[in-house]
Amino acid sequence: KAMHVAQPAVVLANSRGTASFVCEYASPGKATEVRVTVLRQADSQVTEVCAATYMMGNELTFLDDSICTGTSSGNQVNLTIQGLRAMDTGLYICKVELMYPPPYYMGIGNGTQIYVIDPEPCPDSD
């Protein structure tokens, strides 16, 4: 009856501070409206990074000022987080909620540890 959410254990952000991972959920019912939230856990504090609600078969739409983008395909959501810096290294948890039709279901992944390494500044050229 519980909803299982799977996500990779570790992801390394690229040199431009962008990290992508797949959040996959096993839906117990036929949901038509799904909400996906990315949460960051650091020092036992949890903060919301971004959230999007989408209709099955439609694209995810995050708010315009969100650092997240994403696409959906069936029970998979491909999430991309941009603008990351070394200080943003941490555990990023994918939370999936089946919002419609009833009943409501919630699933929480174990988290993806995202490592961000700030690029070395380019040496001055003469």
């Epitope: 009856k1 117990p28 919630m106």
Partner: antibody
């Protein structure tokens, strides 16, 4: 600090209506689901309803479906419970509770007593 | 609807003793979505444990949660005078969210 304060309880006759309010402070209200839970005198806890985020998605216990309406005003950080066709068995302390990021209920308000009696 | 059953209904113990409270679900509930609450007379419930094992902020370590599948346990290792109260388990993974009927821990 995170705080919830309920109001609007009182004595009401069977068949009449009442609206409860819960004012939230100390957190970003529209990032959280909000619940009503009730407790009849000397009894256990009974979940009543939940409303999520923007307020479009709502779920109810069978015992109140069709009679109670949960709503929220995110601009006022306020949760509501409109109770119609009240019955004696609706007599209870009504608590509002936030669904934290993982779904558990924390914190809770202090509760407001609703007594349905003729 | 997931029905939660708690046992025993009442537990009579002395301060310093160990309390073991049980919560059983009518169908398998993931430990991720199981919470315990404490309620004292005239007060609102207070979150003790979430995710079956994790103590809420400010909860002393004499409280611990365990279990999986349909069976969960709340243990109070050494009862303090302030621990005598009613304890409820709850599942919050799917609607309707449900509570157990409660276990009252009173002074022997």
């Amino acid at each position: 600090q995170v705080q919830l304060v309920e109001s609007g309880g009182g004595v009401v006759q069977p068949g009449r209506s009442l609206r409860l309010s819960c004012v939230a402070s100390g957190f970003t209200f529209n990032n959280y689901g909000m619940n009503w839970v009730r407790q009849a005198p000397g009894k256990g806890l009974e979940w009543v309803a939940v409303i999520w985020y923007g307020g479009r998605n709502k779920f109810y216990a069978d015992s109140v479906k069709g009679r109670f309406t949960i709503s929220r005003d995110n601009s006022k950080n306020t949760l509501y419970l409109e109770m119609n066709s009240l019955r004696a068995e609706d007599t209870a302390v009504y608590y509002c509770a936030r669904a934290d990021w993982g779904g558990w209920f924390d914190p809770w308000g202090q509760g407001t007593l609703v007594t349905v009696s003729s | 609807e997931i029905v939660l059953t708690q046992s025993p209904g009442t537990l009579s113990l002395s301060p310093g003793e160990r309390a073991t409270l049980s919560c059983r679900a009518s169908q398998s509930v993931s430990s991720t979505y199981l919470a315990w609450y404490q309620q004292k007379p005239g007060q609102a419930p207070r979150l003790l444990i979430h995710g079956a094992f994790s103590r809420a902020t400010g909860i002393p370590d004499r409280f611990s949660g365990s279990g999986s599948g349909p069976d969960f346990t709340l243990t109070i290792s050494r009862l303090e005078p302030e621990d005598f109260a009613v304890y409820y388990c709850q599942q919050y993974g799917t609607s309707p969210f449900t509570f157990g009927p409660g276990t009252k821990v009173d002074i022997k």
